[in-house]
Interface confidence: medium
Amino acid sequence: EEELQVIQPDKSVLVAAGETATLRCTATSLIPVGPIQWFRGAGPGRELIYNQKEGHFPRVTTVSDLTKRNNMDFSIRIGNITPADAGTYYCVKFRKGSPDDVEFKSGAGTELSVRAKPSAPVVSGPAARATPQHTVSFTCESHGFSPRDITLKWFKNGNELSDFQTNVDPVGESVSYSIHSTAKVVLTREDVHSQVICEVAHVTLQGDPLRGTANLSETIRVPPTLEVTQQPVRAENQVNVTCQVRKFYPQRLQLTWLENGNVSRTETASTVTENKDGTYNWMSWLLVNVSAHRDDVKLTCQVEHDGQPAVSKSHDLKVSAHPKEQGSNTAAENTGSNERHHHHHHHHHH
């Protein structure tokens, strides 16, 4: 009779993570008598996967009943496959021996490859806010996929970005891989409502890529523009001066009025109006009693936005142009100076 051969008909098997792998193996003869064992890998470091004779292998089931006398099918199923299960599996026939069974013949091996989906991409932006015209970096990470081939794209709103660097790690062979990409994005004043999107395409996703997003509202700071104007006189000897704070984001803002450099009032932006682009406007007013001043008054609207150094705008109120009997505001002028105060004023909130 011809000598027993161990046949593993599949050179390779491809299985998705979480599924069951079937590893086929048949013997061509019932002789010699003895058990079969399955191993992952060859040589002294091989890993026992299944032993027909003894042991507990909860993830492994046999395809046919190995207790039947004439059985020559030694195929197994391995459940709940993970990328760590990848490798070459050998079906090995042992000859009954004393005291130990002796390895008789091995199959040619079946390479198990595992397809694993990438995790949902996680996009993270810079730790600190940045102002328009600045370039900021966003990172995107996805893990646990196999095989290694993967495509990553970046978008700002609907537009694909080109300035990015991508690494797939490890660079060598591995059971699963990670991708890490860093994109550079230039901020504009209109980016409060913008989104940065990282899109990952992989063979396991069947054409339905995974996306991770970051809102630029968490990254951008749009500094305010200030305008100080004098309103028509409300009452005799009183002048109403307003400070328009426009197009700022985020909302965190504190305004201080100064009369000739002395703090008059401090308030925090509360009832703001929102612009279409997501930025905010706010207005504060100051009622100045002209009769209380002998000389001209320098009014300053000083704004501290989102913890940044204060910006200010001043307005000169000419007291000489306000005789008590007149309600004219013609001589009042807006200097238009836009000073930066790099010291912080500590005020009691009004």
């Epitope: 690494n167 790690d169 490890p170 660079v171 060598g172 062979e173 890490h180």
Partner: antibody, heavy 119, light 107 residues
């Protein structure tokens, strides 16, 4: 036996380019990657990039991106590294080294090519 | 990019001493770490790959260990020919990077 034979020393002026060759023998050229590593006098080792000799896939260090070009000629079993816009700080010994595809270690090294950049 | 920090930068030892050099990666690199020896005017020579696998032809007095972020190279009984500079290199992620080197000098 496995060996990598590099081209001879070069002296270049700032702004010029240099092309260093690395002839491989004693193994199947297309079965490995070829790395390029440089060493500035008195300093450590700095990886510049690799080429996978089989499929031609190239990876450069960001530091040299735009200035370095790595190529290979499989019929001549030779890898090349060209560095352009040379400056004095590029004066160094440039090594080619055979790379494993799994752990990306460099198991065989050329003797090195000294490139001197001086006006 | 992954940074690899080697320590010490230099050490003095005598023949027969046991010497240990450490290498720390800025993030986990599994066992993708290799060790090289370089003598003045010569190309580096691979000693250990995959953190602990001794390269063919390298004396058994050299050994490597570690995984994740912390690794070490040990020379069990220092020989005269072992006085050289040693470099670790991570091969987990590009750009591949080397440690700054450890110069082993005669005491």
């Amino acid at each position: 036996q496995v060996q990598l034979v590099q081209s001879g020393a070069e002296v270049k002026k700032p702004g010029a380019s240099v092309k260093v060759s690395c002839k491989a023998s004693g193994y199947t050229f297309t079965s490995n990657a070829m790395h390029w590593v440089r060493q500035v006098p008195g300093q450590g080792l700095e990886w510049m990039g690799w080429i996978k000799a089989g499929n031609g896939e190239i990876k450069y260090s960001q530091k040299f991106q735009g200035r370095v070009t790595i190529t290979r000629d499989t019929s001549a079993t030779t890898a090349y590294m060209e560095l352009s816009s040379l400056r004095s700080e590029d004066t160094a010994v440039y090594y080619c080294a055979r790379g494993d595809y799994y752990y990306y270690y460099m198991d065989v090294w050329g003797k090195g090519t000294t490139v001197t950049v001086s006006s | 990019d992954i940074q690899v920090t080697q320590s010490p930068s230099s050490l003095s030892a005598s023949v027969g001493d046991r010497v240990t050099i450490t290498c720390r990666a800025s993030q986990s690199i599994s066992d993708f770490l290799n060790w090289y020896q370089q003598k003045p005017g010569k190309a580096p020579k691979l000693l250990i790959h995959a953190a602990s696998s001794l390269q063919n032809g390298v004396p058994s007095r050299f050994s490597g260990s570690g995984s994740g972020t912390d690794f070490s190279l040990t020379i069990n009984s220092l020989q005269p020919e072992d006085f050289a500079t040693y470099y670790c290199q991570q091969s987990y992620s590009t750009p591949l990077s080397f440690g700054g080197g450890t110069k082993v000098e005669i005491k």
